[in-house]
Amino acid sequence: VPRWRQQWSGPGTTKRFPETVLARCVKYTEIHPEMRHVDCQSVWDAFKGAFISKHPCNITEEDYQPLMKLGTQTVPCNKILLWSRIKDLAHQFTQVQRDMFTLEDTLLGYLADDLTWCGEFNTSKINYQSCPDWRKDCSNNPVSVFWKTVSRRFAEAACDVVHVMLNGSRSKIFDKNSTFGSVEVHNLQPEKVQTLEAWVIHGGREDSRDLCQDPTIKELESIISKRNIQFSCKNIYRPDKFLQCVKNPEDSSCTSEI
């Protein structure tokens, strides 16, 4: 008799999930000598232990604590780049500006980036058919709780000037419901963080508006100021030129506004 299986609204676990996590861990620890003490088998076991045999709508931050402990990593606290709805450009930037870090440049972020996973209550199986959707099913699902946990810890570690890249092409440039808006903003530590500097990335080539005056940016400024953190904002009118100038800052065209 086939066992009844819960049908969730979201896509199932990414195929070859265990192998992918193990492979990413090995690759990361190869590339980052400071993380070579990490035992990737233990990392996988802790990752698996966070969600296997548990109801995928009843996952807690506590479930991920063994994994958090194993993945503890020190990044320069004044070199943190947050992002919202503009991940690819943020990652392109840190690939060039190697002394700055997004969450996905850390071991735990790198392991889970773009992956989906969930298990089933009381079975050791991974569910490759479907996983809970944050809106349609439940917010305390394995993927959402993971990102909430690592994002909180990442924001808590930040100091001095923290940068955030925001997508100026979206209707809500700052979205209170994004991970940045709901988790990271509220976990920056005012006693450590002096300034949050927003980089608003323009989409259209002819777009010369000052998007730092956008109502949602003003809302972000208000939230940050109330937390006793200074706020600044820059328009990045030409993201392609911006990246080019990060690569080649001596270029004569890089003295003008980008």
Epitope: V26, T29, Q41
Partner: nanobody, 122 residues
Framework: EVQLLESGGGLVQPGGSLRLSCAAS????????MSWVRQAPGMGPEWVSG????????YYADSVKGRFTISRDNSKNTVYLEMNSLRAEDTAVYYC???????????????RGQGTLVTVSS
């Protein structure tokens, strides 16, 4: 270039012991899980044992549990298989393999050596 060189095989009587070694080069040894796989004449390969990168996690096939011990020395880039209470059915070519690790069902292997022959016979 990844190289895995097994040694220590030979002829041994039932109930006897052997210690296999595998010297690895061409990769960052300490981040890779290592395993031993064997292939008896006319049979398919059988995973025997595995050890995680740091050596903290070890795994064994039921057929060798309690008789074989896997270990590694990351300072020497070497993995070992201590084999005790050997039986005729342990006769096989023993291969050393590097890989990603064990997910509870599958051992993910990347490279395999040339093997060393173990013969258990009186």
């Amino acid at each position: 270039e990844v190289q895995l060189l097994e040694s220590g095989g030979g002829l041994v009587q039932p109930g006897g012991s052997l210690r296999l070694s595998c010297a690895a080069s061409g990769f960052i040894f300490s981040v890779y899980a290592m395993s031993w796989v064997r292939q008896a004449p006319g049979m398919g390969p059988e995973w025997v044992s595995g050890v995680s990168g740091s050596g903290i996690n070890t795994y064994y096939a039921d057929s060798v549990k309690g008789r074989f011990t896997i270990s590694r020395d990351n300072s020497k880039n070497t993995v070992y298989l201590e084999m005790n209470s050997l039986r005729a059915e342990d006769t096989a070519v023993y291969y050393c393999a590097s890989g990603k690790g064990w997910d509870g069902n599958t051992w993910y292997e990347d490279y395999r050596g040339q093997g060393t022959l173990v013969t258990v016979s009186s």
